[in-house]
Amino acid sequence: KGMHAAQPAVVLASSRGVASFVCEYGSSGNAAEVRVTMLRQAGSQMTEVCAATYTVEDELAFLDDSTCTGTSSGNKVNLTIQGLRAMGTGLYICKVELMYPPPYYVGMGNGTQIYVIDPEPCPDSD
């Protein structure tokens, strides 16, 4: 079943290569287990950046080695991507799946264009 997901159109990463935005999905109602996946679209190719499953009982938990962190509150997920470089500029799409209990719902946002500008190297000083 389809579900609406919303995310900001544009986000500028910090000089440290960190970008944060909120992904909001249609009310989860009685959804107990939700899976959030961050996808990066480059041209016609879509790659998974990170994913996490959380329950209404627990906080959002990404894998320890993930480039993402996040917190959940109701039907909003605050996502943070770290370690971004200029080549990481692109469209980042938030996908939300209401996994349990049935019925299964899935929603995808229109994507957030993240702009990453690598900091200029500091000039050598004598």
Epitope: S27, S28, G29, N30, A32, E33, R35, T53, T55, V56, E57, M99, Y100, P101, P102, Y104
Partner: antibody, heavy 116, light 112 residues
Framework: QIQLVQSGPELKKPGETVKISCKAS????????MNWVKQAPGKGLKWMGW????????TYADDFKGRFAFSLETSASTAYLQINNLKNEDMATYFC?????????WGQGTTLTVSS | DVLMTQTPLSLPVSLGDQASISCRSS???????????LEWYLQKPGQSPKLLIY???NRFSGVPDRFSGSGSGTDFTLKISRVEAEDLGVYYC?????????FGGGTKLEIK
């Protein structure tokens, strides 16, 4: 703290109707499904079904389709189980239970006696 | 419907003994998302059931570590490493993977 408080014991005759209530407190009622479980005297637990407290949509196990109805009074954070045209085999204790990915919270149970 | 079969029906034990209860499902209870919603509950006389284990092997908060759950697919086990008096009662397994969700028939843990 989170509580599910059920209505008191009921004594009914065959053919009558009973409505059992389950009042929730200590959490957002519409965030969690409410399930109903039957336990006949000296028997095990039997899952009757559940109601989505957000949409109001009920799901019934096959044995509980027809005479049984789950309903809600969301403003009062209360779920109801109604049994129509009571039969002797309906004599049991009925539990409500809040489900997420498990049942951590249960009502105390409502004992229904059906006797002519 | 998924039939949950528990064995034994009755389990007489001495306090301090290990107890093991088996639960078999008539088909795999792995849900479409890869999780197995298999739980264990303890019901004492005149009381509501209490959650012990969820998703096969996760102990619910406040449940002593003498309780452990294991298994996969169709075969599941609840172990109590050292039975205490407060552990006596009827144990039920439950599957929440396939609607209609179903309970096992129960295993009565009693003193030998």
């Amino acid at each position: 703290q989170i509580q599910l408080v059920q209505s008191g014991p009921e004594l009914k005759k065959p053919g009558e109707t009973v409505k059992i209530s389950c009042k929730a407190s200590g959490y957002t009622f519409t965030n969690y499904g409410m399930n109903w479980v039957k336990q006949a005297p000296g028997k095990g637990l039997k899952w009757m079904g559940w109601i989505n407290t957000y949409t109001g949509e009920p799901t019934y196990a096959d044995d509980f389709k027809g005479r049984f109805a789950f309903s809600l009074e969301t403003s009062a954070s209360t779920a109801y189980l109604q049994i129509n045209n009571l039969k002797n085999e309906d004599m049991a204790t009925y539990f409500c239970a809040r489900r997420s990915i498990y049942y951590p919270y249960w009502g105390q149970g409502t004992t229904l006696t059906v006797s002519s | 419907d998924v039939l949950m079969t528990q064995t034994p029906l009755s389990l007489p034990v001495s306090l301090g003994d290990q107890a093991s209860i088996s639960c078999r499902s008539s088909q795999s209870i792995v849900y479409s998302n890869g999780n197995t919603y298999l739980e264990w509950y303890l019901q004492k006389p005149g009381q509501s059931p209490k959650l012990l284990i969820y998703k096969v092997s996760n102990r619910f908060s406040g449940v002593p570590d003498r309780f452990s759950g294991s298994g996969s697919g169709t075969d599941f086990t609840l172990k109590i490493s050292r039975v205490e008096a407060e552990d006596l009662g009827v144990y039920y397994c439950f599957q929440g993977s396939h609607v209609p969700w179903t309970f096992g028939g129960g295993t009565k843990l009693e003193i030998k």
